[in-house]
Amino acid sequence: FNMDTRKPRVIPGSRTAFFGYTVQQHDISGNKWLVVGAPLETNGYQKTGDVYKCPVIHGNCTKLNLGRVTLSNVSERKDNMRLGLSLATNPKDNSFLACSPLWSHECGSSYYTTGMCSRVNSNFRFSKTVAPALQRCQTYMDIVIVLDGSNSIYPWVEVQHFLINILKKFYIGPGQIQVGVVQYGEDVVHEFHLNDYRSVKDVVEAASHIEQRGGTETRTAFGIEFARSEAFQKGGRKGAKKVMIVITDGESHDSPDLEKVIQQSERDNVTRYAVAVLGYYNRRGINPETFLNEIKYIASDPDDKHFFNVTDEAALKDIVDALGDRIFSLEGTNKNETSFGLEMSQTGFSSHVVEDGVLLGAVGAYDWNGAVLKETSAGKVIPLRESYLKEFPEELKNHGAYLGYTVTSVVSSRQGRVYVAGAPRFNHTGKVILFTMHNNRSLTIHQAMRGQQIGSYFGSEITSVDIDGDGVTDVLLVGAPMYFNEGRERGKVYVYELRQNLFVYNGTLKDSHSYQNARFGSSIASVRDLNQDSYNDVVVGAPLEDNHAGAIYIFHGFRGSILKTPKQRITASELATGLQYFGCSIHGQLDLNEDGLIDLAVGALGNAVILWSRPVVQINASLHFEPS
């Protein structure tokens, strides 16, 4: 209708990075920009994804290098994290959120794909990381090894081998394990502190240089107390599980201090593993009963989990695996490891800014049934798995509904702001829920809409539209882009109109009648009034139309509803040659060229396209005759 197709601004980018996957218009004190997501962008050797800022009129795009943002205190894996897969602008302060739903971090032997988002302020400066699903690793441990280095330990090289082998089993790194070593005899010394080394390689290297310090006495109580009061303090981390491993070959010369030392360790929640090396006793034919009792006393309860004894120093190698396994059984204590909560949540798969924070879709949460999390300045709200049961019953829990594939919100005059989320795989047909979130981690689900067709991906795209701009939502549009019709993936967009408290189904939007795949409804954007009739409008993308070149459809709002026949269909081929997947993302909230008209930004594979609005001239014809 009034979108100019003759002089679009086609902003080129990398196809391999999928520049254009997401687009958002951006305003910084009058300067207009396009923010473009490129979720497969490379940073160095890693395919992190990134976000570009592109000037609207002319000039080249600049990478924001958000892919370089690192989270401290986690062993992160940024490769393939898909930064820019979702973008959400906050019109209040013109900041935006760029999400990396496949951002993962190492936890023990696993990588947890919790996802994370970067908040970028209005002048394109990174301001904060938003990662509500990120939880401390179960391997967030401070381990202090307390080594008996008294004269009776022989040969020392066996102790060293044991130390190196056990260290190789530890998941050492930021947000995981830190290791410190103290050696004792008559005195106690720090061999190295908890925060001296940040990798297995470095710790092993340091351990290989520890020499036996000797001593005629074995002050085990003092060694343990030194570890508790000093070693765990120097470089120890708040909230880290404290683990102590005591290795000794004889009764202590300060055993009357053990009671108090162990009490203090208990108070500090130090889990103690104790290893009795019986070499000295066996070489001399001494009964080790008193010694073994002492080591059992040192070890945390129950003994069968925390106490080890070996025949001699050489046999230490035989307990490496068992000791490692027992320490890491602390990881998932009483936890059903076959079930995932937020570990694979992929938070930020979708995002939506609300008044008090941001909603983040987490499609992988709760065994890929999905969830919606909320991050606010006051904290985060993570609804419990049970809070979804009303609409996502237990018997379908293995289906992977992907709730949070898209998130938005609606405003009704009765209920105020209500959140909306799509679960396109629910029971194979898809579902959309409208809900409010509570700080006690529960939800109230007000309404649910279900898809009609298996595999249609109903709910993979949702947009709320305030047609008349009165602050109350009039229409909710739900996309089912894989809707199969007439032998093709045609796609469908369902229209729901707000009647009092409920959204009532009111037909579907009409697409063109071609006989190719289209995926109409892959993207749906509520845009500000394009045709200057004072009603806000809607643009729908069909990125597979025209043999994957893509097309968009413009639908006009009218009197609290939406006209279901498109007023304009714009195909990629009209705009430029070589465009592909045009319409995969759409945003239209700003006047980009200062002509007083709202312009459109549309994403394509390797391109972002700006379509300028043209003024609409209203001609009122009137006839009058003379003479009358």
């Epitope: 006495e217 002050r219 109580a221 003092f222 107390e225 009764e251 202590s252 010369h253 300060d254 055993s255 009357p256 201090d257 053990l258 009671e259 108090k260 162990i262 008193t290 009792n293 002492e294 006393y297």
Partner: antibody, heavy 120, light 109 residues
């Protein structure tokens, strides 16, 4: 030769204070524990308190807890028993004794004792 | 706290007699039990440690044994210099709390 010598005993009024010393020689205080044991006239042995001079951990009998304080000065190789709020029932001969690993946690050397009399 | 109940509180015996003194612990304890001899006006002297080990310089007629919570000091052939008071002592494991028995006075018959 291992020796323990107590001093500081004497006559004191109820409610008064006294500080006993136990000077050790022939061994290092840091490698052992010192215990104070008392014996009221005509009565048996009663354990009073102990200290590890290395770690400074202390233990007390319930009858003296809060009134007596055991301490050690390793530079002087001497242990002390500070006795406050003395009562008539604290009247006894006070012995210090060595307690260590090499005697399998038995009191192998004792001082000659010092008499403390609490009387008005 | 562990109590050590010593019996008898006194006994009369003749030179050459075999004398047995028993200490019963109120609960199961380690073998860290010692026996002392004290003569009037003198400090106690260590005889037995670890329930049954003879301290150096102590005559071999003195011996100690353990049976469950019962600890026994035996003088196989009483000598004139053995007339004294004998105390058992128990060390609480892993602390330096100690407890004495009430004492057994061995007198000449």
């Amino acid at each position: 030769e291992v020796q323990l010598v107590e001093s500081g005993g004497g006559l004191v009024q109820p409610g008064g204070s006294l500080r006993l010393s136990c000077a050790a020689s022939g061994f290092n205080l840091t490698s052992s524990y010192i215990h104070w044991v008392r014996q009221a006239p005509g009565k048996g042995l009663e354990w009073v308190a102990s200290i590890s001079s290395y770690s400074s951990y202390t233990y007390y009998a319930d009858s003296v807890k809060g009134r007596f304080t055991i301490s050690a000065d390793t530079s002087k190789n001497t242990a002390y028993l500070q006795m406050n709020s003395l009562r008539a029932e604290d009247t006894a001969v006070y012995y210090c004794a060595r307690y260590w690993y090499y005697s399998a946690w038995a009191l192998d050397y004792w001082g000659q004792g010092t008499l403390v009399t609490v009387s008005s | 706290d562990i109590q050590m109940t010593q019996s008898p509180s006194s006994l009369s015996a003749s030179v050459g007699d075999r004398v047995t003194i028993t200490c019963r612990a109120s609960q199961s304890v380690s073998s860290a039990v010692a026996w002392y001899q004290q003569k009037p006006g003198k400090a106690p002297k260590l005889l037995i440690y670890s329930a049954s080990s003879l301290y150096s310089g102590v005559p071999s007629r003195f011996s100690g044994s353990r049976s469950g919570t019962d600890f026994t000091l035996t003088i196989s052939s009483l000598q004139p210099e053995d007339f004294a008071t004998y105390y058992c002592q128990q060390s609480a494991p892993y602390s330096s709390l100690i407890t004495f028995g009430q004492g057994t006075k061995v007198e000449i018959k």
